[in-house]
C-alpha cells in the first residue's frame, strides 16, 4: 500500500479468482484513543472499533472511503483505491490502446518544434468518475524539470455504439535548448482513477522523435504564362523553430485529382516553391517534415487548382 | 527516406554537400544495423544514449546559431572567440561561427572515425560475419574531414589484445551509430546555417 495523495491510498493486488488479497491496517488521524468506530462509504454499518482497523482487501467491494468517527463526529477519512496486477502486468482498463505507432500505445505525444513544448493525449470510453494527473521529467534517475498543465477533455467522438473521449495535456521542459542533442528521454507519467480503480501509464520519448510540424502556411498558386503549369509557393509555419536555415524543413508537394483513385503526382523539395501541372478539378497540397531528422510529416495544406 | 541530393554550385559553401552525404550514409548504416541485428537491443528505445565526444568537444555550443545565443538554456559552456581557419569558411566572414565550431566538428569526425575503424577490425574477426561498417560511410567521414582541412594530430587506431566480445561489440556499434546520426544531424544543420549566412 502507498499514498497517492493526502488520505488517498493505493492497494496493489495480485488479481486472480480466490486471491488472498492484502491485509491493510488503517489508523485514525486523531489524538483520541477511545470510542472510535469505523464505517465504509455511505453505509452506517460499523466495521470495527478502536484507533486502528485491520481489513483484508480482496475486491472492489473492500475499497472505498473508510471513515473513523467518535460520537457522531467524523475524525478522519482514508480512501482506498485498487491497482490490479494481472499475471505480472498492471491493468490497463481505463485507457484505450491506440495501437499507433505500435500495440500497447496508450499515450501519444507530439511537438510542433524543438522548444521543449509538447502535447500528449489519450482515449477512453469512460465518461464519469474519472480523474487524471500528469507528471513529466527529462530522465528518471536524476530527473530534470518538465511542467505539465491539467489534463482536459479535448474531443468527443462516436465510434460505433460507443462514445470515445480524448483527453490532452500540454507540457513544457523548464530549460530547453532547441539545438541540444537529447541523450535522456522525456518521461511522461499519467495517473488515472476511475471510481475505485487506480492505473498508471507511462511514455518515454525524445522530442526529436515526436516532432510533427504544423502545415506550411500561405499556400499560393501563380499560373505561368502560356502553360498548364503553376508555381506553388508557401512559407514555413509560424510555430516552427527558428532560425529556419538551421532548423530546415523539406516539403512534399502533391497534385491530387477529385477522385481518390486518380494517380497522385508528388514532388519533394527543400525550397518553399515548386512548379507543377495543375489539372482541372485537382487540388495541390503541401506538407512539411524536418529536413535532417525524419520524424512525422505535417498535415497537408491544400488549395484548389481552379 | 532518402534525403534529396543537392548538387552544390561551385561557389557554394563547400562542406554542405559533404555533410548531407554524411547524414545519408550514417542513416543508411543505422538502418542496416537495426535490420541485421534485429535480435540485439539496437533500437533507439533499447540502447543507452552515449556521446563519445562528451567533455572532449563542444559542437552544439560552439556552433550555436546567433539567434539562439539569447537562450540561456543553450549557453552552458560557450566559447566566445571567433573562428579564423578552416577552408569551409571559404573566405566568408561570419559572426555566427565561434572559435570551436568547425574544429569541433572536425574533432568529432576524427573521434568517430577512430572508433568505427577499431570496431570494424573487431567485426571482421567475428566468425558469424554478421555485420561490417559500410566503407562508403567511412569514406564520407574522410571526405568531410578533408574538406574541413584542419591540421590535427593523428589519433592512433586503438588496438586490443583481448579476445573481442562480439555481442558487446555489436551493441556498442548500435550505440555509436545512434549517437553519430544525432551528431550528423547537428553538423548538417550547422552547414545549412553557414551556407545561408
Amino acid at each position: 500500500i502507498w499514498e497517492l495523495k493526502k488520505d488517498v491510498y493505493v492497494v496493489e493486488l495480485d488479481w486472480y479468482p480466490d486471491a488472498p488479497g492484502e491485509m491493510v491496517v488503517l489508523t485514525c488521524d486523531t489524538p483520541e484513543e477511545d470510542g472510535i468506530t469505523w464505517t465504509l462509504d455511505q453505509s452506517s454499518e460499523v466495521l470495527g472499533s478502536g484507533k486502528t482497523l485491520t481489513i483484508q482487501v480482496k475486491e472492489f467491494g473492500d475499497a472505498g472511503q473508510y471513515t473513523c468517527h467518535k460520537g457522531g463526529e467524523v475524525l478522519s477519512h482514508s480512501l482506498l483505491l485498487l491497482h490490479k496486477k494481472e499475471d505480472g502486468i498492471w491493468s490497463t482498463d481505463i485507457l484505450k490502446d491506440q495501437k499507433e505507432p505500435k500495440n500497447k500505445t496508450f499515450l501519444r505525444c507530439e511537438a510542433k518544434n524543438y522548444s521543449g513544448r509538447f502535447t500528449c493525449w489519450w482515449l477512453t470510453t469512460i465518461s464519469t468518475d474519472l480523474t487524471f494527473s500528469v507528471k513529466s521529467s527529462r530522465g528518471s534517475s536524476d530527473p530534470q524539470g518538465v511542467t505539465c498543465g491539467a489534463a482536459t477533455l479535448s474531443a468527443e467522438r462516436v465510434r460505433g455504439d460507443n462514445k470515445e473521449y480524448e483527453y490532452s495535456v500540454e507540457c513544457q521542459e523548464d530549460s530547453a535548448c532547441p539545438a541540444a542533442e537529447e541523450s535522456l528521454p522525456i518521461e511522461v507519467m499519467v495517473d488515472a482513477v476511475h471510481k475505485l480503480k487506480y492505473e498508471n501509464y507511462t511514455s518515454s520519448f525524445f522530442i526529436r522523435d515526436i516532432i510533427k510540424p504544423d502545415p506550411p502556411k500561405n499556400l499560393q498558386l501563380k499560373p505561368l504564362k502560356n502553360s498548364r503549369q503553376v508555381e506553388v509557393s508557401w512559407e514555413y509555419p509560424d510555430t516552427w523553430s527558428t532560425p529556419h536555415s538551421y532548423f530546415s524543413l523539406t516539403f512534399c508537394v502533391q497534385v491530387q485529382g477529385k477522385s481518390k483513385r486518380e494517380k497522385k503526382d508528388r514532388v519533394f523539395t527543400d525550397k518553399t516553391s515548386a512548379t507543377v501541372i495543375c489539372r482541372k478539378n485537382a487540388s495541390i497540397s503541401v506538407r512539411a517534415q524536418d529536413r535532417y531528422y525524419s520524424s512525422s510529416w505535417s498535415e497537408w495544406a491544400s488549395v484548389p487548382c481552379s | 527516406r532518402n534525403l534529396p541530393v543537392a548538387t552544390p554550385d561551385p561557389g557554394m559553401f563547400p562542406c554542405l554537400h559533404h555533410s548531407q552525404n554524411l547524414l545519408r550514409a550514417v542513416s543508411n548504416m543505422l538502418q542496416k544495423a537495426r535490420q541485421t541485428l534485429e535480435f540485439y537491443p539496437c533500437t533507439s528505445e533499447e540502447i543507452d544514449h552515449e556521446d563519445i565526444t562528451k567533455d572532449k568537444t563542444s559542437t552544439v555550443e560552439a556552433c550555436l546559431p546567433l539567434e539562439l545565443t539569447k537562450n540561456e538554456s543553450c549557453l552552458n559552456s560557450r566559447e566566445t572567440s571567433f573562428i579564423t581557419n578552416g577552408s569551409c569558411l571559404a573566405s566568408r566572414k561570419t559572426s555566427f561561427m565561434m572559435a570551436l565550431c568547425l574544429s569541433s566538428i572536425y574533432e568529432d569526425l576524427k573521434m568517430y572515425q577512430v572508433e568505427f575503424k577499431t570496431m570494424n577490425a573487431k567485426l571482421l574477426m567475428d566468425p558469424k560475419r554478421q555485420i561490417f561498417l559500410d566503407q562508403n560511410m567511412l569514406a564520407v567521414i574522410d571526405e568531410l574531414m578533408q574538406a574541413l582541412n584542419f591540421n590535427s594530430e593523428t589519433v592512433p587506431q586503438k588496438s586490443s589484445l583481448e579476445e573481442p566480445d562480439f555481442y558487446k561489440t555489436k551493441i556498442k556499434l548500435c550505440i555509436l551509430l545512434h549517437a553519430f546520426r544525432i551528431r550528423a544531424v547537428t553538423i548538417d544543420r550547422v552547414m545549412s546555417y553557414l551556407n545561408a549566412s
Partner: antibody, heavy 115, light 112 residues
Framework: QVQLVESGGGVVQPGRSLRLSCAAS????????MHWVRQAPGKGLEWVAF????????YYADSVKGRFTISRDNSKNTLYLQMNSLRAEDTAVYYC????????WGQGTMVTVSS | QSVLTQPPSVSGAPGQRVTISCSGS????????VKWYQQLPGTAPKLLIY???QRPSGVPDRFSGSKSGTSASLAITGLQAEDEADYYC????????????FGTGTKVTVLA
Amino acid sequence: QVQLVESGGGVVQPGRSLRLSCAASGFTFSSYGMHWVRQAPGKGLEWVAFIEYDGSNKYYADSVKGRFTISRDNSKNTLYLQMNSLRAEDTAVYYCKTHGSHDNWGQGTMVTVSS
Amino acid sequence: QSVLTQPPSVSGAPGQRVTISCSGSRSNIGSNTVKWYQQLPGTAPKLLIYYNDQRPSGVPDRFSGSKSGTSASLAITGLQAEDEADYYCQSYDRYTHPALLFGTGTKVTVLA
C-alpha cells in the same frame, strides 16, 4: 472453490458452426478476464482468444480471427466461444481458463471437425 | 508455430535432476514473467510455477523455476515416476499481450 465447466463440443462438418460454453462458479466471474485455449490431438497448447472482465476488449489468435467470436454473459457467469466456418485443423480439446498469476482451467470439451 | 522453444523430450532415472529450457526473445520472456504447467495424459494443464520462480501452494518443492534474460528453465530434482508428463512454459509478448504464448512442450520420461 473456483470451478469451470466447458460444454458444447461434438462432431461437426467442415464449414459448419458450433458454440462452446464455459460455466463459472465459486468466484466473482464479472471481475476477471477469461481465455480459451485449445490442444489438437497429440499436439501442444495453443491460445485461441481472450475477453476482458467487462467484455470491452476481445483478442484473437490469427488462426481463428474472423471465424471465432468470444463473448460473455456476466449475469449468467458464462463464457462463450462461437466457432464459424470450422476447419479440420480446428479439431482439438477446448479449455476455458481464468486470467491471472494463479489460473484455473476447465476439464475441456472435444471438438472434432470431420466430413 | 510457437515462439517459445523447448526441447521435445528429456529423461532421467528416479531421484535424478532434470531441467527443461524455454527460449524466447526480448519482447516476450525478456519483458514478461514466465509460468510452467504440467499436463498429465487426458487432463487439463496444472500450474507448477508462476512469476518465473514462485510455486503455488500444493506444488512440491522438487519443482523450481528460474529466468535469465530471454530464457527460462524448470528444474525437477529427485525425479519421481508421477512426474512423467508433458511440461509447457508460458509467457506474453509485450506487443500482443494478453495473448498467451506457450512453449512447444517437453515430454519428461522417467526411466525404469
